[in-house]
Structures are given as C-alpha cells and as structure tokens.
Interface confidence: medium
C-alpha cells in the first residue's frame, strides 16, 4: 500500500531539523526509545509528539535558545516551527488522544530526532516496497 503523505512530510521535516544545530539541540529530552520493546507504533508516535510538545512549550521563549545574535534568533525560530509541524504530523499518524511519558532516560534533542528519523525511514521503506 502507498505511504501516508504525512509520513513523507515527517521525514522531510526531520531532514530539515537534523541538518543544522541550534543553541538548544544539545538540551535533553525524555528518551522514549530507550525501552520501547513492547510499545505499539502508534504509542511511539504519540509519545514522541508528547516529548516534542514538552520541549517546544518549555523552550520556545528560552533566552538561552534565542541566543545573542539575529542569526541564532532566526535559527531557533526555524527549529520551533519544525518541531510544531512534526508534533502535529505525529499526532495525526498516531491517532491517539494522549499517552504517558514516564521514562527516566534522557537523550539530547539532536539524538532524539536522529533516532526518530531512522524509525520513520524504516517505516517508509516498508510501506513503499
């Protein structure tokens, strides 16, 4: 069957997100991938969206992220925009109202996004073959 257009959009957004570092991509987020053995795909997407929402809600106005130069300001703005888009698309793919995020493990946002990109690419290769 054909790949969902949302999945393509997610991969595109993740490619953009992982292309350049910002002041805040080294900050940590809950690592939902550390122990996701008995988690459904929909739950994983839902929990990833929750983690991203927590991140941008907390750091959108963070002066450390906004930086001290116009370039840093615009880069952070771009990061938040992409995270919001990713959040929206992941919710759409998950189709769940809510999901708990209780893991203690942490990873940097950068690593979290790279891991999510790997998962999404794997899913895409399966549905496009």
């Amino acid at each position: 069957h054909k790949c969902d257009i949302t999945l393509q959009e997610i991969i595109k957004t993740l490619n953009s997100l992982t292309e350049q570092k910002t002041l805040c991509t080294e900050l940590t987020v809950t690592d939902i991938f550390a122990a996701s053995k008995n988690t459904t795909e929909k739950e994983t997407f839902c929990r990833a969206a929750t983690v991203l929402r927590q991140f941008y809600s907390h750091h959108e106005k963070d002066t450390r992220c906004l930086g001290a130069t116009a370039q840093q300001f615009h880069r952070h703005k771009q990061l938040i925009r992409f995270l919001k888009r990713l959040d929206r698309n992941l919710w759409g793919l998950a189709g769940l109202n809510s999901c708990p995020v209780k893991e203690a493990n942490q990873s940097t946002l950068e690593n979290f996004l790279e891991r999510l990109k790997t998962i999404m690419r794997e899913k895409y290769s399966k549905c496009s073959s």
């Epitope: 106005k61 002066t63 930086g67 001290a68 615009h74």
Partner: antibody
C-alpha cells in the same frame, strides 16, 4: 491589557541626538523582543532595529553607527537613541512588540521627532 | 537584504468590493510574511502573520495566502477598510516592509 506608551514629541537641531522611550505593560517584558520602526511624513514604514529577549540588538545597515537600542528591565522600558540627526530623520518613531516569532503585534502610539534648524 | 515589493501602490474601490493586494519578496521568505493596516495618524495594526494566520480580533473578511516569494492579502468585502496596507517579512534580518498600498474610496 498589553500597552506600549511612548514619550512625547521632540524638536531637535541637526547634529543633535534624541532618545525616545517606550514603556511596556500588561506582559512579561523580557519574554518578547522590541522593534523600532519609523515613518517619515507621507512615506512608508522603515525598520530601524530590534532588541531581543536576551538583550542583544540588531540594527538595519542604514542606521548602524548612529542608533542605539537599550532597555531597562526594572521599569519595562525600551529606548531608541539616534545621533547625528539630519532633516531626513524627521519622522514618527514607533516601538512595536515582536510576536514570539511572527509579526509585530502591539505598537506604541508613535513619537514625532522633528529635526529643524 | 530582502526587498518586499507591493502592487498596486494605490487603488480605488467601493464598499462591498473584493480587494487583492500582492507582495513579492526578492528571495524566498518561506511563510514568514505579515500584513499591517494603517489609518491616517494612527499606528499600524497587525492583520495577518505567518502568511495566512489572522491576528486576534481581525475580521474574517481579511485573508492572507502565498508562500516563498509571492504573497496576497485579500479583503473579501470592503467595509471601513480604507487605509494603507503594508506587507513585511520576518524570515531574516533585517526585517523589511513593502512600500505600502493605499486603498481609497472610489
């Protein structure tokens, strides 16, 4: 209610400096950037510069070296200082709050600065 | 710097008319375009931000569209909207405005 209240009109001689203030209320001052924009009589809007949430500033090339934007977080007031004034600087100067990322969502009432010998 | 070029520079219209103003950026600004309305002697007011998002309290007759380099402000049915309209990009520094479009009564 968000409000930006600017200082009163100024008349200056060429070569002098002017400092315009913009007092903010109704929101957390340091959560938003503050822009300064001017409008010469009968002309369009011209962006001058911005002071970011962090306190860092960025100026349009046309004003670099002549403009200084500062703020006093204790009084939630932003300032625009323009030096070496010339007649072409006669304009209404506006402060405008930067939306978190998009647009300038609240504007001061404007301050008319007249440069005349 | 990114130039924002508006057209037309002025137009005459009647109450109830549909009015379209366009703005062309000299390079892509993605979706980072805003529109303002300014009435004589008053400060500008934000109408549309991020290309198509109506600002709080702005009537639904105002809409924005476009992406990349081409943006449009549409007033579906002109009311007491006779004013000058400005587009602006906040994609990158320096922030820049279009030269304005004056909407006058026919």
């Amino acid at each position: 209610e968000v409000q930006l209240v600017q200082s009163g009109a100024e008349v200056k001689k060429p070569g002098a400096s002017v400092k315009v203030s913009c007092k903010a209320s109704g929101y957390t001052f340091t959560d938003y950037s503050m822009h300064w924009v001017r409008q010469a009589p009968g002309q369009g809007l011209e962006w001058i510069g911005v002071i970011f949430q962090s306190g860092a500033t960025y100026y349009a090339d046309d004003f670099k070296g002549r403009v200084t934007i500062t703020r006093d977080t204790s009084t939630s007031t932003a300032y625009l200082e323009l030096s070496s004034l010339r007649s072409e600087d006669t304009a209404v100067y506006y402060c405008a709050r930067g939306g978190i990322f998009y647009g300038m969502d609240y504007w001061g009432q404007g301050t008319l600065v007249t440069v005349s010998s | 710097d990114i130039q924002m070029t508006q057209s037309p520079s002025s137009l005459s219209a009647s109450v109830g008319d549909r009015v379209t103003i366009t703005c062309k950026a000299s390079q892509s600004v993605i979706n980072d375009a805003a529109w303002y309305q300014q009435k004589p002697g008053k400060a500008p007011k934000l109408l549309i931000y991020y290309t198509s998002h109506r600002y709080t309290g702005v009537p639904s007759r105002f809409s924005g569209s476009g992406s990349g380099t081409d943006f449009t402000l549409t007033i579906s049915s002109l009311q007491e909207d006779f004013a000058t309209y400005y587009c602006q990009q906040d994609y990158t520094s320096p922030w820049t405005f279009g030269q304005g479009t004056k909407v006058e009564i026919k």
